[in-house]
Structures are given as structure tokens and as C-alpha cells.
């Protein structure tokens, strides 16, 4: 009886693992083995596929074959018993195009209200992704073990921290990799769960802001308790993107190492042009807080996005506010060469109730004020470009009294 060729050959490539699966064409024939040949583009001769010779099952692994993953190859299979079937040719394919990204490795660290996620490619020193290793981004799904309500987080790098979690709570997550340059989305990792720790005695500092004064950066933050010391650290933002790179060394800022106030001032030349991450930690001598949320700090934007300068003309029922270019040291105006939007906050001096106006124009009317009343105003600038999405700090508050009633000019 003539042996039939095997059919329906599938090539599965995950990272550097090359697996072939096929169907037996004739289940009734026993003791059949299968063998594969391969052919590279531009070659006439077929070569025996090592790892896939005289296979008794319907699956084989040819990962040991050192292929150029960007080069098209062809496969053929036949069945063998006393005689052999005819060859069945598989459609040619390029390994890189066919390859899927495997599940990444995930390691978790718990804080009281945060989880640190360390992600690395599932295959170390992968041949398949050798040219793309730096381009991996990751996405994850996280949920509270008790509720199962999922939250998705996209476009993260090999080290990511999730904040604003609840203490002593079990969270579960799974992660997958993507190579956006090649339109490849990977396979999810197994689910990893971790319980956040008991709430720390000292909370982390909050609301970190960077501003520029003269030739210095001023870093400010909020803290719940008094009599604390703080330290500030920085990291090059690009180091976060290096997959599997443990070069994740936070560095100190010389003038912010053991400060007793909720701000520190350091020269602009501490940082070269670039994007940095900053974080702050509090200590009372015995206990230390966890690190604050990391803020992104872009020297190019930060250096020039200064709080606006404004003049107020007071009327009986309104203020006219004229916004000018901010001044640098030496009283020279700063040229801001990107479109800005202004946020103006005003309040009655005796009240805490703030009102807000958002305006693109540099002359703004604040209406509906009471005569002979002191109002305070502060303003900040925002970039209108979504990609930049930066804000200046608020200007110092300026307080003015409205004119008596019936004043129209």
C-alpha cells in the first residue's frame, strides 16, 4: 500500500523555539516515521532538517538549526515505513515574520501602596529579537484578587511601578511584550500575584514640582509631618527603557541629600539637556518612607516653561489681567516658542473658594467681582502640545482691591 504524504503542516515559532506540527494522513498505518528537509532561498538542494528526522510523533523541534531569521526557507515532509510517501511541500516562510514573542519573565516587589514590576524577555539573548531587543515595550493587566476588575496599562518598559494601591491587599497581574516596529504582540506571561505590605508609618512625599529661579532649579514637594529630612534622587529616563538592563542606578543631587525643608535648590548645570526621573524620600531618623511617585523632568521644557508674569488693572466689578513673557535673571524676557494656554486662579482674600479661568489669550477679564474687595490671583502656563503636556508652576499670588462701585473705567 502506498504511503500518503502527511498534511496540514503548521510552523509555530515562539522566540527562538521552532516547532513543527502535522497530521497523519493515514491513522490506520502503524509504525510510521516522518522526516523533514529544508531549503534556503537561492539554493537548489534540500538539506535534512536536524531534530526532525525519523520522528514517530506528529511534532518536532528544530530550534537547534542556526538559521538567518530574516531569510526565507522552505520545508518538505514525507512519511516513511518500508517505503516512503511523496514529499509534501510547506509554503515558504521567513522565520522572523512568523515568529511570536513569548511570555516575558516577571518579578514583583511589594510596597504598602505600590508594586514594582521587573520585566525581562522570556528568552535571554534571543537570536530572533537580537536586533529588536531595545524596542520591546510591555503591557499588563492588573486586578485585585478579591474583585477581579481588570485595569490595563499599555506601553511600559522593563521596570514599572504601579501606585495608589491599597495596603495588605493581594493584586494579580499578567504581562505581554510587543514589538511595535514589527507590529508584533506577544503572549501573556503566567499570572503573578503579590500582597502589598502593611501601611508604612511614614507616607511618601507628594506633589513634586520643579521650577526655575535664576540659574537654579527649585524642587518642591508636600509632606504630612514636620521635623523630617528628605533626600532626592535622579535617573536618566532612557535607562528605564533598556530591557534586561540592571543599570538602574538612582543618583543623588548634591544639594538635596539631607534637606530639612520640603524644597531644595540646585544649579541648572547639574543636569545636561535631557529627560530625567526624580523621586523624593522622607526620614525621621528612625523610619524611612517609601519613595515618592517618580516625576518626569525635561530640562528643555522645564528650563523655559516659567510661570507667566502678569499685570492687573482693577475695576469695580472685574479685573483685567495682561499676561507677559516671564523674566529670567537680568530681567530679560523668555521667548517661549511653543503655543501656551494660561490657567488663572482667583479667590477672595478672606475665603478659600477658588475660581478658575482657562484662556489662550494674553489679556483676560475676570468678571463678577465685588467692589472694594481684595482678590488674589495666580497663574500658570501649560503647553498646548499633547506630546509635551507640561505645566509651569504657579506664579506668586498677586492681591488687588477692586474699585468702588459704578467705576466703569
Amino acid at each position: 500500500k502506498n504511503l500518503k504524504s502527511p498534511q496540514k503542516v503548521e510552523v509555530d515559532i515562539i522566540d527562538d523555539n521552532f516547532i513543527l506540527r502535522w497530521n497523519r494522513s493515514d491513522e490506520s498505518v502503524g509504525n510510521v516515521t516522518f522526516s523533514f528537509d529544508y531549503q534556503k532561498t537561492g539554493m537548489d538542494n534540500w538539506i535534512k532538517l536536524s531534530g526532525c528526522q525519523n520522528i514517530t510523533s506528529t511534532k518536532c523541534n528544530f530550534s537547534s538549526l542556526k538559521l538567518n531569521v530574516y531569510e526565507e526557507i522552505k520545508l518538505r515532509i514525507r512519511a516513511e515505513k518500508e517505503n516512503t510517501s511523496s514529499w509534501y511541500e510547506v509554503d515558504s516562510f521567513t522565520p522572523f515574520r512568523k515568529a511570536q514573542i513569548g511570555p516575558p519573565e516577571v518579578h514583583l516587589e511589594a510596597e504598602d501602596k505600590a508594586i514594582v514590576i521587573h520585566i525581562s524577555p522570556g528568552t535571554k539573548d534571543s537570536v530572533m529579537w537580537a536586533l529588536d531587543g531595545l524596542s520591546f515595550t510591555y503591557s499588563l493587566v492588573i486586578w485585585k484578587n478579591s474583585s477581579g476588575v481588570e485595569e490595563r496599562i499599555e506601553n511600559i518598559y522593563s521596570r514599572h511601578k504601579i501606585y495608589k494601591l491599597s495596603p495588605e491587599t493581594t493584586y494579580c497581574l499578567k504581562v505581554k511584550a510587543a514589538l511595535l516596529t514589527s507590529w508584533k504582540i506577544g503572549v501573556y506571561s503566567p499570572v503573578h500575584c503579590i500582597k502589598t505590605t502593611v501601611e508604612n508609618e511614614l507616607p511618601p512625599p507628594e506633589n513634586i514640582e520643579v521650577s526655575v529661579q535664576n540659574q537654579n532649579y527649585v524642587l518642591k514637594w508636600d509632606y504630612t509631618y514636620a521635623n523630617m529630612t528628605f533626600q532626592v534622587q535622579w535617573l536618566h529616563a532612557f535607562l528605564k527603557r533598556n530591557p534586561g538592563n540592571h543599570l538602574y542606578k538612582w543618583k543623588q543631587i548634591p544639594d538635596c541629600e539631607n534637606v530639612k525643608t520640603t524644597q531644595c535648590v540646585f544649579p541648572q548645570n547639574v543636569f545636561q539637556k535631557g529627560i530625567y526621573l526624580l523621586r523624593v524620600q522622607a526620614s525621621d531618623g528612625n523610619n524611612t518612607s517609601f519613595w515618592s511617585e517618580e516625576i518626569k523632568f525635561d530640562t528643555e521644557i522645564q528650563a523655559f516653561l516659567l510661570p507667566p508674569v502678569f499685570n492687573i488693572r482693577s475695576l469695580s466689578d472685574s479685573f483685567h489681567i495682561y499676561i507677559g513673557a516671564p523674566k529670567q535673571s537680568g530681567n530679560t524676557p523668555v521667548i517661549q516658542d511653543y503655543p501656551l494656554i494660561y490657567e488663572i486662579i482667583f479667590w477672595e482674600n478672606t475665603s478659600n473658594a477658588e475660581r478658575k479661568i482657562i484662556e489662550k489669550k494674553t489679556d483676560v477679564t475676570v468678571p463678577n467681582l465685588k467692589p472694594l474687595t481684595v482678590y488674589c490671583v495666580k497663574a500658570r502656563a501649560h503647553t498646548m502640545d499633547e506630546k509635551l503636556n507640561k505645566s509651569s508652576v504657579f506664579s506668586d499670588a498677586v492681591c488687588e482691591k477692586t474699585k468702588p462701585g459704578n467705576t466703569s473705567k
Epitope: H236, N245, H246, L247, K251, Q252, K273, G274
Partner: antibody
């Protein structure tokens, strides 16, 4: 001002183990990464590896199978061991401190010439 | 590992000359590049960090520029004490690597 003082055997036979120690004087030992770097005669610099106070290490993969860097916090010292040396390991070996303010080596030892010869 | 290639490997110049040395990385290292000066029998000394930051106590005639894969060290007006060997080094990823060096000699 921090000073790095290094010492160790200067002449070894092939297959022996190179051992060098670097002592840190006049400065903090914590919060810093401490490296070993070598320079074969008339050639360029090669980073060997580093250690931090906790004992956590990173090594150059080209030497990883033969290298151990260890730390003795009580003496403010760190050490380099390189096993199975050959003539190719002949070099001036430097200990160095990576700045805590930035990504660069800001203090270096005086260097120790280690010669491997039968 | 990231490889750094310096050019030229050696050059001759005179006091007062403007000199430029380049360093090229095999992959993007952003600004994680350092320049050192080494004199015979001495350990290297920091000149430039983060591609363009001037090291403490380093004369302002030294400057660095570049980001990504191409970097430059410039000495605006050579002084007698500047004749030495110069190395670039990357801190972007492990293992740290150095360029092969550029030897600057008196013409």
C-alpha cells in the same frame, strides 16, 4: 577627599589566581558602586565588574566565569579575584569609584601591574 | 556589548590648535557617554560626563557634544598639559565599555 589604595601580588604563573584589594580612605563606603578596571600594557581600558555595599555585583560577561568581586564593609575594602590566569590577563588593574552624583568614575586607585608569566 | 570606536587612533597637533576627537557607539546610548584623559603611568581622569557636562575642575577649553551614537570631544586651544590619551566610555548598559583610545601627540 576620598583615596583608593590598592595592593596585591604583581607576578603570577599561568593557572594561578589573581587577588587584589582596594581600601577606601577618607570617604563614605555606602551609596557607591566600586569597580575594577584593567589596562593591558599599551592598550585600552576594560571594565571587569562592580560591587555595592550590599554585596550585589555586576560582571563583564567576557570574564564572568573567572571573576569574583567581594566587599569587607568592616574594613572599607573590596577585592578582586580572577582565577586561571593566562598571559592575556597581564595588565595594570585599577580600582575605581562610580560617583553617586552621576554616571562616571570620579576616584581611581593608583593601579597595580600584574604580570602573568611562566 | 556596545562597542565604541574612537577616531582618529592618534593625532599630532600644536599648542593653540583646536582638536576634535569622535566616538561612535554601535547602538543608541542617549547621553550616557563619558570622556577621560590619561597620562602615562597615571589613572584616567574625568573630563566630560553625560556627553556634554564639564567635570569638576576641568578647564573650559574642553567640551563635549552629541547624543545617540555620535559624540565629539573638542579642545578649543591645546595647552602643553593636554598631550595625553583620551578615552570615551559608555554607561548606558552592562558591560560598561571604553573606546580604544586616541593618543594626542605634539607635532
Amino acid at each position: 577627599q576620598v583615596q583608593l589604595q590598592q595592593w596585591g601580588a604583581g607576578l603570577l604563573k599561568p593557572s594561578e589566581t589573581l587577588s587584589l584589594t582596594c581600601a577606601v580612605y577618607g570617604g563614605s563606603f555606602s551609596n557607591y558602586y566600586w569597580s575594577w578596571i584593567r589596562q593591558p600594557p599599551g592598550k585600552g581600558l576594560e571594565w571587569i565588574g562592580e560591587i555595592i555595599l550590599s554585596g550585589s555585583t555586576n560582571y563583564n560577561p567576557s570574564l564572568k566565569s573567572r571573576v569574583t568581586i567581594s566587599v569587607d564593609t568592616s574594613k572599607n575594602q573590596f577585592s578582586l579575584n580572577l582565577t586561571s590566569v593566562t598571559a592575556a590577563d597581564t595588565a595594570v588593574y585599577y580600582c575605581a569609584r562610580e560617583s553617586k552624583w552621576g554616571y562616571y568614575f570620579d576616584s581611581w586607585g593608583q593601579g597595580t601591574l600584574v604580570t602573568v608569566s611562566s | 556589548a556596545i562597542q565604541l570606536t574612537q577616531s582618529p587612533s592618534s593625532l599630532s597637533a600644536s599648542v593653540g590648535d583646536r582638536v576634535t576627537i569622535t566616538c561612535r557607539a554601535t547602538q543608541d546610548i542617549s547621553i550616557a557617554l563619558v570622556w577621560y584623559q590619561q597620562k602615562p603611568g597615571k589613572a584616567p581622569e574625568l573630563l566630560i560626563y553625560d556627553a556634554s557636562g564639564l567635570g569638576s575642575g576641568v578647564p573650559s577649553r574642553f567640551s563635549g557634544s552629541g547624543s545617540g551614537t555620535d559624540f565629539t570631544l573638542t579642545i578649543s586651544s591645546l595647552q602643553p598639559e593636554d598631550f595625553a590619551t583620551y578615552y570615551c566610555q559608555q554607561f548606558n548598559s552592562y558591560p560598561y565599555t571604553f573606546g580604544q583610545g586616541t593618543k594626542l601627540e605634539i607635532k
